[in-house]
């Protein structure tokens, strides 16, 4: 995803005014409670960000820098130290990482609770993925609707994506794909994967050819996750947009129904951003609608879409869900994952541009060992004596966090948690346990990737009919 500075105070102020206007228009148009609630929650989150940045409440019609009376009749904002999350920036001051319960409230999504996990288990007849059991996928929008459809033998499809900003992908990039592969397997449904090479061209200093070649290289890593070639279509925006009238028509429909004010409010665009950036959200939204893929779904517009993605992508799909009913399509459902922490700590997302912040899919066994031992933030004590006496802190220990992602055995993970917390297990031993999980995982991925030929990539990326069993 592109990187940008958090919006200036004035931009944030204008975003709030814009979002307030959106809320008003939804209310004046008697929109559904869900639409109004989610727009209001987005507004509240913007106001909280404003308070965190300005040190005072947002006041309607009183831009930053203008003196205003201190009292405010609106609802109280929470404390100033708010997490900041948008598609380009993820910031928190807490070593534990983002407060995801707060994020659910701010974004107006729903928590993936025991009840929903049990329902997924009943519907699929499969043990829920450890990403669900451990709260790595923690939030959703309308997943119950998807399960209703599935239980009534109605079709749905999966959509996820990747912004191919460099050839090197890190283990964090695998999270949505590992989970999406599981979803594809247990629900036996088609999947579309968008490679947003156009986005990367717009946001990064790349040529079009470079952006496209990154998309193809990244596609190899994605294919290596084990997706079913008969049920998966991977596409480059630069490639597919020109050959699919169904896709482009939806992009244009979305563009017509979303104002510049709205995208400014949602994404913090400024007047100096190029028009490509401003219209890009429509391109990421279009795959949410089934007739963007006529070769797969013909001209059907009623097939529900389920999008597994990291929570920072939610603003794109809030916009998508807002526009869907206005262009006659069902709203896509979403499953949100937590962020994969950087080796140095959970305060930020990992970055592919900082080699020591990440374990890359190209790393050797030796590099993995060195990076974990040298750079993985520890929740252990300063001395062995103290550690034995007081134990380590799993909440901030990156090695333990990584194990929650990659160690599938629940019993082993729980034993490690107990031993580390009690002080029976030292930091070096915890890091060793992680290295022993990561080294074979990466080696196996590299072996599978080697088997992905250009012909296989071409087949995955060719628009075609997929095999599935929809009425």
């Amino acid at each position: 995803m592109p990187n940008s500075e958090p919006a200036s105070l004035l931009e944030l102020f204008n975003s709030i005014a814009t979002q307030g206007e959106l809320v008003r228009s939804l209310k004046a148009g008697n929109a559904s409670k869900d639409e109004i609630d989610s727009a209001v929650k987005m507004l509240v989150s913007l106001k909280m960000s404003y308070k965190a940045a300005a040190g005072e409440d947002y006041k309607a019609d009183c831009p930053p820098g203008n003196p205003a009376p201190t009292s405010n009749h609106g609802p109280d904002a929470t404390e100033a130290e708010e997490d900041f999350v948008d598609p380009w920036t993820v910031q928190t001051s807490s070593a534990k990482g983002i407060d995801y319960d707060k994020l659910i409230v701010r974004f107006g999504s729903s928590k993936i609770d025991k009840e929903l996990i049990n329902r997924i288990e009943r519907a699929t007849g499969q043990r829920p993925h450890h990403f669900l059991r451990r709260g790595i996928f923690f939030s959703h929008r309308d997943m119950n609707q998807v399960l209703d459809a599935y239980e009534n033998k109605k079709p749905f499809y999966l959509y996820t994506g990747r912004g191919p900003s460099s050839e090197a992908m890190h283990v964090g990039h695998l999270i949505p794909f590992i989970f999406t592969k599981w979803l594809q397997d247990v629900f036996n449904v088609p999947l579309v994967i968008q490679m947003t090479d156009d986005e990367k061209y717009l946001w990064k200093d790349l040529t079009l050819d470079q952006a496209y070649s990154y998309a193809v290289e990244n596609a190899k890593d994605i294919i290596a996750c084990g997706f079913d070639i008969n049920k998966t279509f991977i596409f480059s925006d630069l490639d597919y947009m020109g050959m699919s009238s169904g896709f482009y028509k939806n992009v244009v429909k979305i563009q017509k129904h979303v104002t510049f004010n709205q995208v400014k409010g949602i994404f913090g665009f400024t007047d100096s951003d190029c028009i490509g950036k401003i219209s890009f959200p429509a391109i990421q939204a279009a795959p949410s609608f089934s007739n963007s893929f006529p070769q797969i779904f013909r001209d059907r517009t009623d097939i529900q879409c389920l999008i597994p993605c990291a929570i920072d992508q939610d603003p794109y799909f809030r916009m998508t869900r807002d526009v869907a009913p206005r262009i006659g399509y069902p709203k896509p459902a979403l499953l949100h994952s937590t962020f994969f922490p950087a080796l140095q700590g959970a305060q930020t997302k990992m970055s592919a541009s900082d080699p020591n912040s990440s374990i890359f899919l190209t790393d050797t066994a030796k590099q993995i060992k060195t990076k974990v031992n040298k750079h993985a933030f520890s929740g252990g004590r300063d001395t062995i004596e103290e550690h034995r006496q007081f134990g380590g802190n799993c909440d901030v220990d990156v090695s333990f966090m990584y194990l929650t992602f990659f160690l599938e055995d629940d019993d082993k993970l729980e034993q490690i948690r107990k031993d580390y917390t009690s002080g029976a297990m030292l930091t070096g031993e915890l890091k060793k346990a992680l290295i022993e999980v990561l080294q074979p995982l990466i080696a196996e991925h590299q072996a599978r990737r080697k088997e992905v030929t250009d012909e296989i990539v071409k087949e995955f990326m060719t628009p075609r009919k997929l095999s599935f069993d929809f009425q």
Epitope: V23, R24, K27, I36, D37, K59, A60, C62, H73, G74
Partner: antibody, heavy 121, light 110 residues
């Protein structure tokens, strides 16, 4: 179609009580802040009270504080105004109004037809 | 005595442009949105302008609102006989924690 229908007005003696109701239809009542606004015969508009969509934030005009209570029942799509210790100066047509803004800003896009409250001995 | 001050009356002939002022303070108009309402004889008020200058759908573009500092104004161009009504400005007041209206302006179309 959005509709707001006030009821419960009438003649009451000074010091007496009345409960006004406003039945809402044609929109998702629970998503909107609501207000009561009154107008004494031949006079201007006077805002009386406001309540947030969920009922957690409530505001009153100084002239009615401690005597009037605003409430809502979202399951019944109804807004209420309990008026106690009524005075002659409370005589007015009472309107309920829907606030379409997002922060109780007084953006009243729909109004009821009003109900007359007369306080007289 | 209203918190927001409006002239009690205004008049104009058909086709003319008339302006109604609304004066407040830093705690109301100075830091909050201004709203304008039209009340035709014997009817409930109707929202005419919201957020200082925006028109709800259905309100003709002959009506326009503006705000500067602690004052606001409503302009009606191309005056028509059906515009004869009472006009009220309103705004939230932070120091009172209350919504305040102007005293109203009776517009007569001559």
């Amino acid at each position: 179609e959005v509709q707001l229908l006030e009821s419960g007005g009438g003649l009451v003696q000074p010091g007496g009580s009345l409960r006004l109701s406003c039945a809402a239809s044609g929109f998702t009542f629970s998503s909107y802040d609501m207000s009561w606004v009154r107008q004494a015969p031949g006079k201007g508009l006077e805002w009386v009270s406001a309540i947030s969509s969920g009922g957690s934030s409530i505001y009153y005009a100084d002239s009615v504080k401690g005597r009037f209570t605003i409430s809502r029942d979202n399951s019944k799509n109804t807004l209420y105004l309990q008026m106690n210790s009524l005075r002659a100066e409370d005589t007015a047509v009472y309107y309920c109004a829907r606030d379409v803004a997002w922060d109780m800003l007084g953006d009243f896009d729909y109004w009821g037809q009003g109900t007359l409250v007369t306080v007289s001995s | 005595q209203s918190v927001l001050t409006q002239p009690p009356s205004a008049s104009g002939t058909p086709g003319q442009r008339v302006t109604i002022s609304c004066t407040g303070s830093s705690s109301n108009i100075g830091s909050n949105y201004v709203y304008w309402y039209q009340q035709l004889p014997g009817t409930a008020p109707k929202l005419l302008i919201y957020a200082n200058s925006k028109r709800p759908s259905g309100v003709p573009d002959r009506f326009s609102g503006s705000k500067s500092g602690t004052s606001a104004s409503l302009a009606i161009s191309g005056l028509r006989s059906e515009d004869e009504a009472d006009y009220y400005c309103g705004a939230w007041d932070d120091s009172l924690s209350a919504y305040v209206f102007g005293g109203g302006t009776k517009l007569t179309v001559l």
